[in-house]
């Protein structure tokens, strides 16, 4: 397991919510991405491929998410001070093999200015 701080801007604030950006390498074809708050799984997204290269996207812990070819964004809304914590992107790479897990994260600071325009 590889651990580290995200070397990119992980938190993007907008309208009283936050987009948490979890990046993965372009070469990765099949994976599971989990968003952890402290040690708790908040969200997950799993991408797998079928025999004809069809794609399946599944979530056991569903959050509003957005998938691109090198990132998964998880969206948290209605921010309040209780959201302040360490957040981690827990990436399990299935394909290409061998199986590998990487953990990157950062601390989400909540400031009054980010609470002003909450989405309902």
């Amino acid at each position: 397991e590889i651990n580290g701080s995200a070397n990119y801007e992980m938190f993007i604030f907008h309208n009283g919510g936050v987009q948490i950006l979890c990046k993965y390498p372009d070469i990765v074809q099949q994976f599971k991405m989990q968003l952890l708050k402290g040690g708790q799984i908040l969200c997950d997204l799993t991408k797998t491929k079928g025999s004809g290269n069809t794609v399946s996207i599944k979530s056991l812990k569903f959050c509003h998410s957005q998938l691109s070819n090198n990132s998964v964004s998880f969206f948290l809304y209605n921010l309040d001070h209780s959201h302040a914590n360490y957040y981690f992107c827990n990436l399990s790479i299935f394909d290409p093999p061998p199986f590998k897990v990487t953990l990157t994260g950062g601390y989400l600071h909540i400031y009054e200015s980010q609470l002003c325009c909450q989405l309902k």
Epitope: T48, K49, G50, S51, G52, T54, S92, F94, F99
Partner: antibody
Framework: EVQLVESGGGLVKPAGSLTLSCVAS????????MHWVRQAPGKGLEWVAV??????????YYSDLVKGRFTVSRDDSQGMVYLQMNNLRKEDTATYYC????????????WGQGTMVTVSS | DIQMTQSPSSLPASLGDRVTINCQAS??????LSWYQQKPGKAPKLLIY???LLADGVPSRFSGSGSGRDYSFTISSLESEDIGSYYC????????FGPGTKLEIK
Amino acid sequence: EVQLVESGGGLVKPAGSLTLSCVASGFTFSDYFMHWVRQAPGKGLEWVAVIDTKSFNYATYYSDLVKGRFTVSRDDSQGMVYLQMNNLRKEDTATYYCTATIAVPYYFDYWGQGTMVTVSS
Amino acid sequence: DIQMTQSPSSLPASLGDRVTINCQASQDISNYLSWYQQKPGKAPKLLIYYTNLLADGVPSRFSGSGSGRDYSFTISSLESEDIGSYYCQQYYNYRTFGPGTKLEIK
């Protein structure tokens, strides 16, 4: 212990039909893509068909040589996979293997011992 | 469909020899290539997947390499139990096997 056991092979006349069965045990069958691979006597291996898992809506794919004549299906509750073969030709004579593959999270590949199909008048 | 070619079709070798089998795909298969060993009357056995990763329990004398369209399989020192037929298989899109290589004692 992982086991794949094929059955249903035998002698059939050209243009006839046959259904092969394969029963799986010892692994989580519903997570695996199930393939049929055949081998004519003294020849090499030839992929025939695959049926994907429920996550992929049980999608099926066939080699050009059998498309329109063969149908693969599965029953996850029984751990069974089937190959319905219609309009059989002499060149379909082969040992038919049932195989199970998975790539997530690790790559595994299991094979049965095969069942012989002979197409002859 | 992706086509696979394999060479040589027959490979006489002596015990202890280093032997190499080549496989070529009709298009780039992005390392989605496996190698199988088959002994007479038996089902094939997976040796290598994703070009160079050894399947569980496979001895380290077996290895694989390659990229794009071109791949190879090597036995560093041939043992008597290695005699049989070897097949490459692409799994980039569905499955296709190479025609096979029969490895025999010289």
